[in-house]
């Protein structure tokens, strides 16, 4: 009776157990009673990341500049090249095949979370006593200006867009 | 220090059930495919079963098929062996064995063993 | 199923001797073969794996060679505590076998 399963690094054809390529290396032929499996590496630009019997290696990604995209980690005959956005951009997926702008955050919001080559900028609405005037990608909530400790008192109040407005405090006469 | 321990050996009636216990340590138990080989008094060795690293597959030697079943729990580092409807000739020393693919890049195509093994449990069937 | 036949089944020898065993299968198995040194009360110890490649930690004077279906254990000068039972397997696929044994006696 011929097997029907074989060990973590073995494959079942032709009622044999045969040696999987490693990592790096392609399937060229089974192996037999008397023979064993035949691998060849990998070429430049392709890569198997796994124990494997595949016959034709996997191209490395294209990190393609027009997309924003630029080189993170060079592949290998083991590994996938790994891509990521230029300076001020994000990818669209965790494949991160593509890249859009960092959202910036309109005034009355500040930034919670810069962003990153891989997730965008996280917007926080400005509490009471913060303010953002400004649309930005970096910048967080502003506190409001403390008029008592410049001996100043409020004379405009503040919004979650504006600071509030210090002047002198009224001289009895 | 990489280990093996087995228990749940004894004295049984014929058709009787047993389950034996393999407990791991000093190694990633996870990550290795596992075995269990038996021994009857003064004989030679004979595998009895075989499991993968995540318990997905399995495999008896005809002698034991449909009565025995191997299994693991990874996250109590424990391999299993459940013995049913066992027979005086199912007497021996049962021990659980790790697997190991030896394999260095350039000596391809690697090759398997049995680098570490337990003590052994004695599993006596009789009436 | 494979069978293995290992010759001879017991064999006498003197310190300082050279011996060999054999194991022959009943198919090819390429170097899937691993080879086990056993003493009374003790499980086995793994010596040779892919028919030729030293366990670490075994003395070199052991050896394996052979592929396809004929292969040898070889002890190059025996040592006291090589007294022994000797086994080889094939881990070539499911179900996989043992040899029936050496038994290695000083004289």
């Known amino acids: 009776e011929p097997p029907t399963a074989c060990r973590e690094k073995q494959y079942l054809i032709n009622s044999q157990c045969c040696s999987l390529c490693q990592p790096g290396q392609k399937l060229v032929s089974d192996c037999t009673e008397f023979t064993e499996t035949e691998c060849l590496p990998c070429g430049e630009s392709e890569f198997l990341d796994t124990w494997n019997r595949e016959t034709h290696c996997h191209q490395h990604k294209y990190c393609d500049p027009n997309l924003g995209l630029r080189v993170q980690q060079k592949g290998t005959s083991e590994t996938d090249t790994i891509c990521t956005c230029e300076e001020g951009w994000h990818c669209t997926s965790e494949a991160c095949e593509s890249c859009v702008l960092h959202r910036s955050c309109s005034p009355g919001f500040g930034v919670k979370q810069i962003a990153t080559g891989v997730s965008d900028t996280i917007c926080e609405p400005c509490p009471v006593g913060f303010f953002s005037n400004v649309s930005s990608a970096f910048e967080k909530c502003h506190p409001w200006t403390s008029c008592e400790t410049k001996d100043l008192v409020v004379q405009q109040a503040g919004t979650n867009k504006t600071d509030v407005v210090c002047g002198p405090q009224d001289r009895l006469r | 220090e990489v280990q093996l321990l087995e228990s749940g050996g004894g004295l049984v009636r014929p058709g009787g059930s047993l389950r034996l216990s393999c407990a791991a340590s000093?190694?990633?138990?996870?990550?290795?495919?596992m075995n269990w080989v038996r021994q009857a008094p003064g004989k030679g060795l004979e595998w009895v079963s075989y499991?993968?690293?995540?318990?997905?597959?399995?495999d008896y030697a005809d002698s034991v098929k449909g009565r025995f079943t191997v299994s693991r729990d990874n996250s109590k580092n424990l391999l299993y062996l459940q013995m049913n409807s066992l027979r005086a000739e199912d007497t021996a020393v049962y021990y659980c064995a790790r697997d190991v693919f030896f394999f260095d890049s350039s000596g391809f195509p690697g090759a398997y063993g049995m680098d570490v093994w337990g003590q052994g449990t004695m599993v006596t069937v009789s009436s | 199923d494979i069978q293995l036949t290992q010759s001879p089944s017991s064999l006498t020898a003197s310190v300082g001797d050279r011996v060999t065993i054999t194991c022959r299968s009943s198919q090819g198995i390429r170097s899937s073969l691993a080879w086990y040194q056993q003493k009374p009360g003790k499980p086995p110890k793994l010596l040779i794996y892919?028919?030729?490649s030293l366990e670490g930690g075994v003395p070199s004077r052991f050896s394996g060679s052979g592929s396809g279906t004929d292969f040898t254990l070889t002890i190059s000068s025996l040592q006291p505590e090589d007294f022994a039972t000797y086994y080889c397997q094939q881990l070539n696929s499911f179900p996989s076998t043992f040899g029936q044994g050496t038994k290695l006696e000083i004289k």
């Open positions: 499991i993968s690293s995540s318990g997905e597959t399995t």
């Open positions: 892919g028919a030729s």
């Open positions: 000093g190694f990633t138990f996870g990550s290795y495919e």
